[in-house]
């Protein structure tokens, strides 16, 4: 707080608000009998521009000119020292410094919709730091001038509030826009322009699709303008995609065909208009319209796969597979797929409709030639159906890929290569890769992957469904007409070490040796495929190193035999497994003493 | 913003002195700097004098020596004692004040009374 100047004065010139680069002149003077007791010559007065001295002077005054002052406020106090006494405040000066107006740029001028009102922008340039009033003028025809005023730090921006209207679209109009504050003033360039140059038309508005037949090859787009338009630009796309398509239209009059548009697709819409081919600016583009196109009838087959199981010597079970067509083959929403199933030779047919499956698994007769066709359905009509003959895929032994073999590659990929068969490698019309979780009961609920892959490819990446840590059944067929061959290998797309070992459920005696039994690693606990089980013996109570038999591991089986024990010794027994890797922690163990006599 | 009320002037002859008053209400920003203006007709306005919140003057070189600016910040108020007046000082007279608003400053005006100097 600096005391009201009781002992003495400070003036400034030329004023406190001055301009960035000038100079001001700061004059501390005491009033009279104020100075230090007995000699004025001891009077010394200082002043400090905030806490730095600046300067000083013995006697009543002290006149400094100050230069170089930064933008915004500098304070400056004037002090008197007296010796052998503290410094007493005189009097304090705030300087503030500021810019003059620079000259507006970019003066532009619209007026939103015929009915709408003349409103102008510009640029104010470096910011001033004051006050600075901004006045715009219009002038028109016939010695027309309207005039608005701003009176705040940061305008740029003002709107006349008049209308321009059509009568004489030609004339010429200027607007000027002068900015002054307490430093100086600049007047920006005159602007000329017409009614057709501001005018920029409201957005359309009131838009609506129509699609005679319920077609979408007969679409035509509806909207409302304002009335001087002649010109519009149409943009549309697919909800889902980024990209416009654009199209440019001239006296339009409210409405435009649309010829390209895709089947059961959400579209956006929207709509621009503009006064005049050349002069002037495009209005706004109207609010969205969002419409759903009608459907056509399905494109493209679908990709049919099946797996056949022998029941009984007089049955088996077809298992149908097939894939969801693309959403631009739909079409439209899939209500059904029609499955057909027919005995060639006798020309038996049945036909089933199945919802909210792409799978359908039913029982035929061992004998026969059959044959199955499967479309999709949506409420426009049909796909072409896939036609497909029930073979032995693997009967033809000469088709057989050879040295199939499943690589991880990656995350959750594996790549599975293989060899032509060796019978005429030309004879393969398309491989068949298929993949399916392994699971060791053989359990036909698992869903079934595959994918097609051209004669001369041999490889193939798979990656749909595939997830870590699961060992997956992969068969490789190559087809031929009404032939096929097939191999199959396991293959995992990372993997570890297995979490647990087999659980011994039961060793029993045989002639001499023992057959051991185990239940399966749960799947989950497997990490991997398995790639062998080990089977460790010793005798109980010996610090000896533990026996062991290797078995490659098969899905089926769940016992080995062992026939090195000794008689009437007993033994600990456990079990791991194995897979590329490494080794499981132990599985229980069990102990066991061979009754029989010794060879 | 701040509103400013301006008082005092009217009909002096040559010679004679006036007190001009101003108050300032309205907005709690702290008021930097208050100032006379004065404009003749047919003229620009010009700076008669200013007072800054710390007490500090400035004058234009036609009024030194007669005019005194003085303020009270406490309520806002600033006075010019016009002493000495001539012919040539006859003009609306206008207060202003320059508030801090962040790093700027805004200015207000009053509306103007008339000063009328009499030979």
């Known amino acids: 707080k600096i005391d009201a100047c009781k002992r003495g004065d400070v003036t400034v010139k030329p004023s406190h608000v001055i301009l960035l680069g000038s100079t001001v002149n700061i004059t501390c003077s005491l009033k009279p009998r104020q100075g230090c007791f007995h000699y004025s010559r001891r009077n010394k007065l200082i002043l400090y521009k905030f806490d730095r001295r600046i300067n000083f002077h013995h006697g009543h005054s002290l006149n400094s000119q100050v230069t170089g002052l930064p933008l915004g406020t500098t304070l400056f106090v004037c002090k008197l020292a007296c010796i052998n006494s503290d410094e007493i405040q005189i009097c304090g000066a705030e300087i503030f410094v500021g810019v003059a107006p620079e000259q507006p740029q970019n003066l532009s001028c619209i007026q939103k919709g015929e009915q709408g009102t003349v409103a102008c922008t510009w640029e104010r340039g470096r910011d001033t730091h004051l006050y600075t009033e901004y006045t715009l003028q219009l002038s028109g025809p016939k010695n027309l001038t309207w005039q608005k005023q701003c009176k705040d730090i940061y305008c740029d921006y003002l709107d006349f509030g008049i209308n321009l209207t059509p009568e004489s679209p030609e004339s010429n109009f200027t607007a000027k826009v002068t900015a002054v504050n307490s430093l100086g003033s600049s007047s920006s360039l005159p602007s000329t322009f017409t009614f057709l140059d501001i005018v920029r038309p409201l957005p359309p508005w009131d838009i609506r699709i129509k699609f005679q037949k319920a077609s979408v090859s007969r679409c035509t787009l509806y909207w409302r303008d304002e009335g001087l338009v002649l010109l519009n630009r149409l943009r549309y796309r697919p909800s889902n995609s980024r990209l416009w398509n654009m199209v440019n239209v001239t006296k339009a009059k409210g409405r435009h065909d649309l010829l390209d548009l895709k089947p059961f697709t959400e579209y956006e819409f929207q709509i621009s208009s503009k006064l005049h081919l050349y002069k002037g600016s495009w209005s706004d583009w109207s609010e969205s319209l969002r419409a759903q196109t009608p459907e056509e009838e399905p494109t493209g087959m679908l990709d049919v796969w099946y797996m056949k199981r022998h029941i009984d010597y007089s049955r088996q079970q077809i298992s149908l597979f097939w894939k969801n067509l693309s959403v631009s083959e739909a079409r439209g929403k899939i209500l059904h797929y029609q499955v057909t199933l027919q005995e060639l030779t006798g020309g038996k047919a049945m036909t089933q409709n199945i919802t909210g499956h792409t799978s359908w698994t039913t029982v035929i007769p061992r004998t026969g030639n059959w044959a199955v066709a499967v479309s999709a359905a949506n409420s426009k009509g049909s796909s072409l159906p896939t036609r497909i003959n029930i073979m032995n895929l693997c009967e033809a032994g000469l088709l057989a890929p050879r040295q199939v073999s499943a690589n991880s590659e990656g995350m959750d990929n594996i790549l599975v290569t293989w060899q032509p068969p060796r019978k005429d490698p030309s004879a393969v019309q398309e491989y068949v890769v298929e993949w399916r979780e392994l699971h060791p009961g053989g359990d036909t609920q698992v869903p079934l992957n595959w994918l097609r892959s051209r004669p001369y490819n041999v490889s193939a990446l798979i990656s749909e469904n595939i997830k870590s840590y699961i060992c997956y059944e992969i068969r490789v067929y190559a087809l031929s007409g009404d032939q096929g061959g097939c191999s199959s290998i396991l293959g995992n797309s990372k993997h570890k070490a297995p979490l647990s070992g087999p659980h011994i459920n039961a060793i029993t005696e045989e002639k001499g040796s023992i057959l051991i039994s185990w239940n399966s690693i749960p799947v989950q606990e497997q990490m991997g495929c398995l790639l062998h089980y080990r089977i460790y013996w010793k005798e109980r109570d010996s610090n000896s190193q533990p026996q062991l038999c290797e078995i490659p591991y098969r899905v089926s089986q769940n016992s080995h035999p062992i026939n090195s024990l000794q008689p009437r010794v007993t033994y600990v027994l456990w079990m791991t497994a194995l897979t590329a890797a490494g080794e499981s922690s132990h599985g229980n163990e069990r102990e066991f003493c061979l009754q029989g006599k010794a060879n | 913003q701040v509103q400013l009320q301006e008082s005092g002037g009217g009909l002096v002859q040559a010679g004679g002195s006036l007190v001009l008053s101003c108050a300032a209400s309205?907005?709690?920003?702290?008021?930097?700097?208050m100032s006379w203006y004065r404009q003749a007709p047919g003229k620009q306005r010009e700076l008669v004098a200013e007072?800054?919140?710390?007490?500090?003057?400035t004058y234009a070189d036609s009024v030194e020596g007669r005019f005194t600016i003085s303020r009270d910040n406490a309520k806002d108020i600033v006075d010019l004692q016009m002493n000495s007046l001539k012919p040539e000082d006859t003009a609306v007279y206008y207060c202003?004040?320059?508030?801090?608003?962040?790093?700027?400053?805004?200015?207000?005006w009053g509306r103007g009374t008339q000063v009328t100097v009499s030979s």
């Open positions: 007072v800054s919140r710390y007490g500090s003057t």
């Open positions: 202003k004040a320059d508030q801090y608003y962040g790093d700027s400053l805004r200015s207000s």
């Open positions: 309205g907005s709690a920003a702290l008021i930097f700097l």
